[in-house]
Interface confidence: low
């Protein structure tokens, strides 16, 4: 069937249109296009005949219209009033006509809208505001987009006038946003420039801040005003009643007792007449004096002396406070508080008591610190210790000896060799020593304070000859797998070299032995029962050598799973069983039996004569080193026949 | 704008623990003494704790001292209350305060700037 389709439906003015011919017939004399619904001479647009390809324009032929071989019409430059229907009227080569009509519609390219307000500056709460969208257009529908979201859903929101006014009643402030209009027709759509809402509001009641309504004497009061309004809001302050500014912050420096009062901040909004008031009570307090500390005893002797720390000026009503440290009190049977916390006395003072102490006094508004003391504690002198620590010196060296002993004050030092009194210096110097120079070297350590002395004892052997070392280990039973030893050759003496075998032979290379302190120190990490060798240390200088007596490592280890003799499990009804249980171990370990889970005896051997069938079943040894602490154990199955 | 805004708070059984956090921002928090306070329901808003601006010194209210521990970490803007052995008693609205130098404070007067609080709940 012969149908137009128009392309497109919806045509802008100015635009062009297609009108479509769909299943044309064949065999055609020609075709001729009408405007209207009917074929009408006066109105035909343009005739084509197909044998002459002519087209001849009719009386409605407006010069915008083209004819396709197709029969398919193109129309330019469309204008209003092209709306409307057309007919194509088809004449067969056979004298039989056939028609069909299409349609479209012309609507015009819509302007960008704009917006329109009866009131610029609505007040909140009041004022009711409505916007009309311009211009007003025929076959436009109108839409309304607030912040760039479609309109919500409100009672105090009213579309009228066919969408094309919005109207807010009683306008907030929070109705202050953005406003857009939109025109749409089926060939165009066009938004407007935003309009924001004006909305004036306030003053609400001020806020005062700071929160706090109390000071010091002497602190500076500084109070902000602020009152949520539009326009801003105009600020006085009022103390007491009386006016004193008009500015949003009030500052009093360095307030006094005097200053205690009212204060009120007035906000005024001139746009919208009202005015709003806050008012806070400020109490200003008088300044306490600052803490001081006092002792008892400014230089205390260790161990001996007590302290008595007091925290000044006495105050009533008033709490003290106490820290050490920076930190507060530590519980300590040697710290003790009086009733009214105001004396700290400290009993047997020690030199880690130096401090600082601090004091503070505290009223219901603050706390206030005194300036920290630190007490002189008189303690020591400790036992002092000589350096180096060398025993064995060659002929001709210096012997230079340095002795030092915690000590406050610090100490005073003598030397004494063999009981004489050499000098009174914390270094003693001998050049180019001796044979004769061998013997017992004493430091002695004064504290002139406390009135008390300390001692040390050194000897010192000058010879040509090194003596025979020894070796000292920090563990004598150390434990597989678990433990470290560490052996040193004793003594440790000047320009030496130590030298260091095991079973006779020099250390081999392992990541788990390390030598240190100058060779020294040899340290055998994570030993094993393979460890328990021969240890030997030498000692020697370019005139003489020295090997020390071997040193046996006793490596504890074990228990391993033991093993359980004959390895038989089968027997005949009437032979004797005698099971032997062996596991490595140092030290030995301890045996024990189960059979079938049920304890025997504590022996290395089991023996059962004459066995019957009676006798099947599981065989446990059980083995434990109480040195190691560990413990293994083995099962075997033993079947009697009959 | 100066804000504190506290974290941490929740329902604990007697004998539990808590750690409160308070977020400080728009000031200078290494110059402000930091406070605790607490209100529990138709009672006035009490002191808790205090710790002065370089965290030397702490205060404590006695019926805390011993079970909660202030600190701060000025790098951080945060101060931190520490409470162990939580009693019934401790149920409250606990707030952070801060206030700017001088000696501190024991009471809610002379603190500047508050939060909004953070919800303490101790039952079994």
């Known amino acids: 069937k012969l149908t137009i389709e128009s392309t497109p439906f919806n045509v802008a003015e100015g635009k062009e249109v297609l009108l479509l011919v769909h299943n044309l017939p064949q065999h055609l004399f020609g075709y001729s296009w009408y405007k209207g619904e009917r074929v009408d001479g006066n109105r035909q647009i343009i005739g084509y005949v197909i044998g002459t390809q002519q087209a001849t324009p009719g009386p409605a032929y407006s010069g915008r219209e083209i004819i396709y071989p197709n029969a398919s019409l193109l129309i330019q430059n469309i204008i209003q009033n092209d709306t409307g229907f057309y007919t194509l009227h088809v004449i067969k080569s056979d004298l039989v006509n056939e028609e069909a009509t299409g349609q479209f519609r012309v609507y015009p390219e819509l302007p960008k809208p704009s917006i329109s307000s009866n009131n610029s500056k609505p007040v909140e709460d009041k004022d009711a505001v409505a916007f009309t969208c311009e211009p007003e257009t025929q076959d436009a529908t109108y839409l309304w987009w607030v912040n760039n979201q479609s309109l919500p859903v409100s009672p105090r929101l009213q579309l009228s006038n066919g969408n094309r006014t919005l109207t807010l009643f009683n306008v907030t402030r929070n109705d202050t946003a953005s406003y857009k209009c939109e025109t749409q027709n089926p060939v165009s759509a066009r938004r407007s420039d935003s309009v924001i809402l004006n909305v004036l509001y306030g003053p609400d009641a001020p806020t005062i801040s700071p929160l706090n309504t109390s000071y010091r004497s002497g602190e500076n009061l500084n109070l902000s005003c602020h009152a949520a309004s539009n326009p801003p809001a105009q600020y006085s302050w009022f103390v007491n009643g009386t006016f004193q500014q008009s500015t949003q912050e009030l500052f009093i420096p360095n307030i006094t007792v005097n200053n205690s009062g009212s204060y009120t901040c007035q906000a005024h909004n001139s746009d919208t007449g009202l005015n709003r008031t806050t008012v806070t009570t400020i109490t200003v307090y008088a300044e306490p004096p600052k803490p001081f500390i006092t002792s008892n005893n400014s230089n205390p002797v260790e161990d001996e002396d007590a302290v008595a720390l007091t925290c000044e000026p006495e105050i009533q009503n008033t709490t003290y406070l106490w820290w050490v440290n920076n930190q507060s009190l530590p519980v300590s049977p040697r710290l003790q508080l009086s009733n009214d916390n105001r004396t700290l006395t400290l009993l047997s003072v020690t030199r880690n008591d130096v401090g600082p102490y601090e004091c503070g006094i505290q009223n219901e508004l603050s706390v206030d610190h005194s300036d920290p003391v630190i007490l002189n504690v008189l303690y020591g002198p400790d036992d002092p210790t000589i350096s180096p620590s060398y025993t064995y010196y060659r002929p001709g060296v210096n012997l230079s000896l340095s002795c030092h002993a915690a000590s406050n004050p610090p100490a005073q030092y003598s030397w004494l060799i063999d009981g004489n009194i050499q000098q009174h210096t914390q270094e003693l110097f001998i050049s180019n020593i001796t044979e004769k120079n061998s013997g017992l070297y004493t430091c002695q350590a004064n504290n002139s304070a406390s009135g008390h002395s300390r001692t040390t004892v050194k000897t010192i052997t000058v010879s040509a000859e090194l003596p025979k070392p020894s070796i000292s280990s920090n563990n004598s039973k150390p434990v597989e797998d678990k433990d470290a030893v560490a052996f040193t050759c004793e003594p440790e003496a000047q320009n030496t070299t130590y030298l260091w075998w095991v079973n006779g032979q020099s250390l081999p290379v392992s990541p788990r032995l390390q030598l240190s302190n100058g060779n020294r120190t040899l340290t055998l990490f994570n030993v094993t029962r393979n460890d328990a060798r021969a240890y030997v240390c030498g000692i020697q200088n370019s005139v003489s050598a020295n090997r020390s007596d071997p040193v046996t490592l006793d490596v504890l280890y074990g228990p391993d799973t033991p093993i359980i003799s004959p390895p038989d499990s089968s027997y005949l009804s009437g032979a004797n069983l005698n099971l032997s249980c062996h596991s490595a171990s140092n030290p030995s370990p301890q045996y024990s039996w189960r059979i079938n889970g049920i304890p025997q005896q504590h022996t290395q051997v089991l023996f059962i004569a004459k066995i019957t069938p009676n006798n099947n079943g599981t065989y446990a040894c059980f083995v434990s080193n109480l040195a190691t602490g560990r413990n293994n154990s083995i099962v075997k199955s033993i079947t009697v026949s009959a | 704008e100066v804000q504190l805004v506290e974290s941490g708070g929740g329902v604990v059984q007697p004998g539990g623990s808590l750690r409160l956090s308070c977020a400080a921002s728009g000031l200078t928090f290494s110059t402000y003494t930091m406070g605790w306070f607490r209100q529990a329901p138709g009672k006035e808003r009490e002191f808790v704790a205090a710790?002065?601006?370089?965290?030397?010194?702490?205060y404590y209210a006695d019926s805390v001292r011993g079970r909660f521990t202030i600190s701060r970490d000025n790098a951080k803007n945060t101060v931190y209350l520490q409470m162990n052995s939580l009693r019934p008693e401790d149920t409250a609205l606990y707030y952070c305060?801060?206030?700017?130098?001088?000696?501190?404070?024991?009471?809610?007067?002379?603190?500047?700037?508050w939060g909004q609080g953070t919800l303490v709940t101790v039952s079994s």
């Open positions: 305060a801060a206030q700017h130098f001088g000696p501190i404070g024991l009471t809610t007067r002379g603190y500047h700037y």
């Open positions: 710790i002065i601006w370089s965290g030397s010194n702490t």
